[in-house]
Interface confidence: low
C-alpha cells in the first residue's frame, strides 16, 4: 500500500494473507471461503494445498495467526493468465470453517443497490501487506482511502504504451488520485477494495486488487480492481454448488476451472 | 339280525376366557369386547406423542392373541412418552431448554440462538418442538438444524472498536 497508514486491530477483520509462490491477499466470505484475484493463485494451480492462508493478524511475519488450508480453488473460466487481467477473480474454499470474532469477520458481497455507494469520487479502502513507498513489503497491515476514478479517464490512462489497447475492461474499476501517491501495489494482489454501505452500516467488497502501472502510486495512473458486482452470480453459483460447509479435511486440494492451460512464459508485472 | 352301531361320544367344553385386557396409561384397547376367548385378539394404540414399548424396545404395532390355556400370547406393552433426545449442537450457537431443564419429551420446546454479534440465524426463528415422530421440528416443519451464518462487514472503523 502506497501513501497509507497502519491498520488497527479489528479494522479489516476480513483480510487474509496468502503465501504461496509470492505474498498476496484475499478477503474472507462467510466462514470458509476466500475471495481473491485469479493471478494471485494461478501459479499454485498444480498444488492448491500449498497455499498457506493466514488470518486474524496484523503483522505479516507474526507467528500468531489463524491458519487455514485450501480444499479447492476456483479460477474464473474467463481468466487467461498471459492475456491481460479480465476476469481476474478466484474463490478458495477452505477445508474448515474458521471461528468468527472481532479479528476474523467476513466481508459482505455487494447488494444490488451497492452501485450507489461506488460512483466516481466515492471513497473505497484498500488494505494489504504489499510494497510501500519505501520499497519493502509492509510488516504491519496498511490501508489507504482512495476515490473511484471515472472509467473513461482510467481507460484513457492505460491506452498508451506500454499498456496494450483494451487493458481496462468493463469488468474493472479504477481508484486512486490523479496526483498519485495513494495506491495498492505488488503484494496487495487479491485483497479487497471495500466500501461502506451507509444504509446497513456494513462494509462490502467492491473491488479486488488486480493490476496497475509499473510504478505504484504514479501520477496520472490508477490502481485497477476487479469489479466484484459483475461476478455476483458466478460467486453465488460456486458457493451454492460446492457447499457452504468445510469438509473438515481429508482428500487432496484441487483447482477447478474451465480454462485451457497455456504456457505462462510471460510473467506480468502486477500488484 | 340285530344291527350293531358304534359308540357315539359327545365332548362339550367351555373355552377358557383370557383376562380382560387393561389398557396401559396413555393407550387404548381395540376392539373392546365383553370377553376374549380362544383366538380372539386385541391391539393396543397409544395416544399421540406416546410410543409402544416392550421393555426398552419400541414396537411398530402390538396385537395379542388369546391362547387355549386362557393366557395372552404376549405381555402387555407400555405407552411411553416420545423422547426426542438431547438436541444436536448448533455450530456457533447454543440451545436453551424452554419447557424445563433437560426436558426432551413430546411437546417440549427448545430455543436455538447464535453467538451474539458475530453470527445471525438463518432458515427459521430457532424455536423447535419435540413432535410425535420423535424429531425436533421447527414452526416451519423443518427437522434440520437452523444455521448460524457469520455477520459480514463489521469493522472497528465504523463501530469504534468492539
Amino acid at each position: 500500500i502506497y501513501g497509507g497508514q497502519k491498520a488497527k486491530p479489528g479494522d479489516f477483520p476480513w483480510q487474509v494473507l496468502i503465501l504461496g509462490g509470492t505474498t498476496a491477499a484475499g478477503a474472507l466470505l462467510y466462514d470458509n471461503w476466500v475471495l481473491t484475484a485469479a493471478h494471485a493463485v494461478y501459479e499454485q494451480k498444480h498444488d492448491a494445498s500449498a497455499l498457506d492462508i493466514r488470518m486474524g493478524t496484523l503483522k505479516r511475519l507474526s507467528p500468531h495467526y489463524t491458519q487455514a488450508w485450501s480444499e479447492a480453488v476456483f479460477i474464473h473460466e474467463g481468466y487467461t493468465h498471459d492475456a491481460g487481467f479480465d476476469n481476474d477473480i478466484a474463490l478458495i474454499k477452505l477445508n474448515n470453517k474458521v471461528v468468527i470474532n472481532s479479528n476474523i469477520t467476513p466481508i459482505c458481497l455487494p447488494r444490488k443497490e451497492a452501485e450507489s455507494f461506488m460512483r466516481t469520487d466515492d471513497i473505497g479502502t484498500a488494505s494489504g501487506w504489499g510494497l510501500t513507498q519505501r520499497g519493502f513489503l509492509a510488516r504491519n497491515l496498511m490501508y489507504v482511502d482512495i476515490p473511484i476514478v471515472d472509467h473513461q479517464k482510467c481507460t484513457a490512462a492505460y491506452e498508451k504504451p506500454p499498456y496494450p489497447r483494451g487493458s481496462v475492461t468493463a469488468n474493472m474499476l479504477c481508484a486512486g488520485l490523479e496526483s498519485g501517491g495513494k495506491d495498492s501495489c505488488r503484494g496487495d494482489s487479491g485483497g479487497a477494495l471495500v466500501f461502506l454501505d451507509s444504509e446497513t452500516e456494513r462494509w462490502f467488497v467492491g473491488g479486488i486488487v488486480s493490476w496497475g502501472s509499473m510504478n505504484c502510486g504514479e501520477a496520472g495512473q490508477y490502481g485497477v480492481y476487479t469489479k466484484v458486482i459483475n461476478y455476483i452470480p458466478w460467486i453465488e453459483n460456486i458457493i451454492s454448488d460446492f457447499g457452504g460447509g468445510g469438509s473438515g479435511g481429508g482428500g487432496s486440494a484441487k483447482f477447478v476451472a474451465a480454462w485451457t492451460l497455456k504456457a505462462a512464459a510471460h510473467h506480468h508485472h502486477h500488484h | 339280525m340285530a344291527s350293531m352301531t358304534g359308540w357315539k361320544i359327545h365332548y362339550t367344553s367351555t373355552a377358557h376366557a383370557c383376562p380382560y385386557p387393561m389398557a396401559p396409561p396413555n393407550g387404548h384397547v381395540s376392539p373392546v369386547q365383553a370377553k376374549y376367548i380362544l383366538k380372539d385378539s386385541f391391539s393396543i394404540f397409544c395416544e399421540t406423542g406416546y410410543e409402544l414399548l416392550q421393555g426398552h424396545l419400541p414396537l411398530k404395532s402390538f396385537t395379542a392373541v388369546c391362547q387355549k390355556d386362557g393366557s395372552w400370547d404376549r405381555p402387555m406393552p407400555a405407552c411411553s412418552i416420545v423422547d426426542c433426545g438431547p438436541p444436536d449442537d448448533l455450530p456457533s450457537g447454543r440451545v436453551e431448554y424452554i419447557t424445563g431443564p433437560g426436558v426432551t419429551t413430546y411437546k417440549a420446546v427448545i430455543q436455538y440462538s447464535c453467538e451474539e454479534t458475530f453470527y445471525t440465524m438463518k432458515v427459521n426463528d430457532g424455536k423447535y418442538v419435540c413432535e410425535a415422530d420423535g424429531f425436533w421440528t421447527s414452526s416451519k416443519g423443518e427437522k434440520s438444524l437452523p444455521v448460524c451464518e457469520p455477520v459480514c462487514g463489521l469493522s472497528a472503523r465504523t463501530t469504534g472498536g468492539r
Epitope: 500468531h64 495467526y65 489463524t66 474448515n96 479435511g249 | -
Partner: antibody, heavy 125, light 107 residues
Framework: EVQLVESGGGLVQPGRSLSLSCAAS????????MAWVRQTPKKGLEWVAT????????YYRDSVKGRFTISRENAKSTLYLQMDSLRSEDTATYYC??????????????????WGQGVMVTVSS | NIVLTQSPATLSVTPGESVSLSCRAS??????IHWYQQRSNESPRLLIK???RSISGIPSRFSGSGSGTDFTLSINRVESEDFSIYYC?????????FGAGTKLELR
C-alpha cells in the same frame, strides 16, 4: 542462529522446589510462544507447559497443574519454569522450545520448531 | 488423551534403503501430526509439520503423508546420519502427546 540455553537443573528432594531458566537468542523472542517439554527413558517425550508470546495465557499438562508455573521476561528474552512440590515422576530432561501456533476449529494447536540442549532434573530422596 | 502408536519400535536398515515409519492415532487428528528426529545425546529436531509439510533446512529425502488416524514418515535412501529415533506428535488435542518413537538402526 536460533539458540536456546537451559539452566537451573540438578538434584532435589521430593516436595522441594526448583526453577529452570532458558536464555533465547537469534530470533525475536517476543514474537514466539514458548514451551517446556520433558523426556524420560520410561515415558518418552511429554509436553509440560506453554506460554503465549505476550505472556497473556499459559497452558499445562494435567499432572503439573497447580505445581508448575511457566513465565517469561520478554525484555531479557528469558523463559522460566518454576517447579514446586516436586515428585519423583518429575525426574526428566527438560527442554525449552519455541512453539509455532495454529488455530483450527477453535482449538489451539502447535508444534515445536527449535529446542534447547536440555537440562537434567532429578527428584530423589 | 490421544494415544500415538509408532511401529515398528526398531527398524534395522542398510544405508541406501528406503523406509517408512508408521504413526497411528487413537482417534482422528485430521492432519495435526508432526515428526521429529532425535539423534543420540541430542535434542529433538522438527522434520515435518502437519503430516506432510516440509521444513526448511531438512533434506528432501524426508517426506510425510497421511490424515485421520494413519500417518507415515518416509525416508528415501537412508544415509548414515539418519540413524536416530523418530517421534510423531499430535496437536489436535490441546494436550499435546508424542509417540514412543521408532529407532532406526544400522543392520
Amino acid at each position: 542462529e536460533v539458540q536456546l540455553v537451559e539452566s537451573g537443573g540438578g538434584l532435589v528432594q521430593p516436595g522441594r522446589s526448583l526453577s529452570l531458566s532458558c536464555a533465547a537468542s537469534g530470533f525475536t523472542f517476543n514474537d514466539y510462544n514458548m514451551a517446556w517439554v520433558r523426556q524420560t527413558p520410561k515415558k518418552g517425550l511429554e509436553w509440560v507447559a506453554t506460554i503465549l508470546f505476550d505472556g497473556s495465557r499459559t497452558y499445562y499438562r494435567d499432572s503439573v497443574k497447580g505445581r508448575f508455573t511457566i513465565s517469561r521476561e520478554n525484555a531479557k528474552s528469558t523463559l522460566y519454569l518454576q517447579m514446586d512440590s516436586l515428585r519423583s515422576e518429575d525426574t526428566a530432561t527438560y527442554y525449552c522450545s519455541t512453539e509455532s501456533p495454529y488455530y483450527s476449529e477453535g482449538y489451539y494447536q502447535g508444534y515445536f520448531d527449535y529446542w534447547g540442549q536440555g537440562v537434567m532434573v532429578t527428584v530423589s530422596s | 488423551n490421544i494415544v500415538l502408536t509408532q511401529s515398528p519400535a526398531t527398524l534395522s536398515v542398510t544405508p541406501g534403503e528406503s523406509v517408512s515409519l508408521s504413526c497411528r492415532a487413537s482417534q482422528s487428528v485430521s492432519t495435526s501430526i508432526h515428526w521429529y528426529q532425535q539423534r543420540s545425546n541430542e535434542s529433538p529436531r522438527l522434520l515435518i509439520k502437519y503430516a506432510s509439510r516440509s521444513i526448511s533446512g531438512i533434506p528432501s529425502r524426508f517426506s510425510g503423508s497421511g490424515s485421520g488416524t494413519d500417518f507415515t514418515l518416509s525416508i528415501n535412501r537412508v544415509e548414515s546420519e539418519d540413524f536416530s529415533i523418530y517421534y510423531c506428535q499430535q496437536s489436535y488435542s490441546s494436550l499435546y502427546t508424542f509417540g514412543a518413537g521408532t529407532k532406526l538402526e544400522l543392520r
